[in-house]
Interface confidence: low
């Protein structure tokens, strides 16, 4: 089948990184600079993505694959394939339309991106607050007051429920 197909369509023999050049009797021509074809048999090469402005090049374009962008330091990617860059804030802040704002009391953000989230409500699990929350860190819940009755052995505080997020930069 492949052989028959290639006899009928000479373009099917053109590998990735080339295009089937109708102007040159359907021979396989290399993709021009700043363009690529990621599959064989293509009649044109696609223009490479340019990482301009706040974007910077994570992976340079080759004849067979598009460039990949990420964001310059101080910004992080949003969207599929890093279609947008959003400004980083400090831990303990969130990005609003007016820029980076501190988390309100009772909320925290342990990353340079994302929104402030409410502190864990320890009492919902029947526990007490062992370590108070801050703008940057969630509260640490400890044993319930009943567990700390006289004679009870001392308890090592549990690790926080979620591991602090690693910032993108």
């Amino acid at each position: 089948f492949e052989r028959t197909r290639s006899l009928q369509d000479p373009c099917s023999n053109c590998p990735a990184g080339t295009f089937c050049d109708n102007n040159r009797n359907q021979i396989c021509s290399p993709c021009p600079p700043n363009s690529f074809s990621s599959a064989g048999g293509q009649r044109t090469c696609d223009i490479c993505r340019q990482c301009k402005g706040v974007f910077r090049t994570r992976k340079e374009c080759s004849s067979t694959s598009n460039a990949e962008c990420d964001c310059t330091p101080g910004f992080h990617c949003l969207g599929a394939g890093c279609s947008m860059c959003e400004q980083d804030c400090k831990q303990g802040q969130e990005l609003t339309k007016k820029g980076c704002k501190d988390c309100c009391f009772g909320t925290f953000n342990d990353q340079k991106r994302g929104i402030c989230r409410p502190w864990t409500n320890c009492s919902l699990d029947g526990k007490s607050v062992l370590v108070n929350g801050t703008k940057e860190r969630d509260v640490v819940c400890g044993p319930s007051p009943a567990d700390l009755s006289p004679g009870a052995s001392s308890v090592t505080p549990p690790a926080p429920a979620r591991e602090p997020g690693h910032s993108p930069q």
């Epitope: 706040v54 994570r58 990420d70 101080g74």
Partner: antibody, heavy 117, light 112 residues
Framework: QIQLVQSGPELKKPGETVKISCKAS????????IHWVKQAPGKGLKWMGW????????AYADDFKGRFAFSLETAASTAYLQINHLRDEDTATYFC??????????WGQGTTLTVSS | DVVMTQTPLSLPVSLGDQAAISCRSS???????????LEWYLQKPGQSPKLLIY???DRFSGVPDRFSGSGSGTGFTLKISRVEAEDLGVYYC?????????FGGGTKLELK
């Protein structure tokens, strides 16, 4: 060929304002960000911040927030560094440089600023 | 901020010698995208800095192959296999992985 040409040396008094220019040629100005670097006499290089030439948005290192302002004249392919309320410690050579793929491939020749009463 | 510490401060050499400059960062320079944005620049007296090495070990166009870069994480080295007169000057390492971007303090390569 690609060039970044900066304005000439400046002699200023404390409290005055200076505006240094960096004119780019030989490439599409808005495709590459422009960064500014300070070098005090006999000292090392210090990154001041950068200008997004596509959006005109600046970003400053903490030590250069307040009295320092980056700006652009895109039609003239020129970036500017303005320093207000000059101090003695602003005496330095200031470089503009182009960022390509995250590294600085072309640099201006530097502008020497002397602040003295 | 990421602190870049270069050693030695001064490196006296004879022409033809091998030279090595070390650069340490206060935190890893591996970016979340997998790249490590560590560069080396050379500044000669009265001149602008010039790019030698980017992304740890990639030589910039026109840079002689006697210059090589290596390292990962927080430790990096620039080596010059045979020092020539035109190599003398101050070498700076630089990180572009974390905001704010930072230079090392510089290493002066000079004749003995």
């Amino acid at each position: 060929q690609i060039q970044l040409v900066q304005s000439g040396p400046e002699l200023k008094k404390p409290g005055e304002t200076v505006k240094i220019s960096c004119k780019a040629s030989g490439y599409s100005f808005t495709d590459y960000s422009i960064h500014w670097v300070k070098q005090a006499p006999g000292k090392g290089l210090k990154w001041m911040g950068w200008m997004n030439t596509e959006t005109g948005e600046p970003a400053y290192a903490d030590d250069f927030k307040g009295r320092f302002a980056f700006s652009l004249e895109t039609a003239a392919s020129t970036a500017y560094l303005q320093i207000n309320h000059l101090r003695d410690e602003d005496t330095a050579t200031y470089f503009c440089t182009r960022s390509s793929y995250g590294y600085f491939d072309y640099w201006g020749q530097g502008t020497t600023l002397t602040v003295s009463s | 901020d990421v602190v870049m510490t270069q050693t030695p401060l001064s490196l006296p050499v004879s022409l033809g010698d091998q030279a090595a400059i070390s650069c340490r960062s206060s935190q890893t320079l591996e970016h979340i995208n997998g790249n490590t944005y560590l560069e080396w620049y050379l500044q000669k007296p009265g001149q602008s800095p010039k790019l030698l090495i980017y992304k740890v070990s990639d030589r910039f166009s026109g840079v002689p192959d006697r210059f090589s870069g290596s390292g990962s994480g927080t430790g990096f080295t620039l080596k010059i296999s045979r020092v020539e007169a035109e190599d003398l000057g101050v070498y700076y390492c630089f990180q572009g992985s974390h905001f704010p971007l930072t230079f090392g303090g510089g290493t002066k390569l000079e004749l003995k």
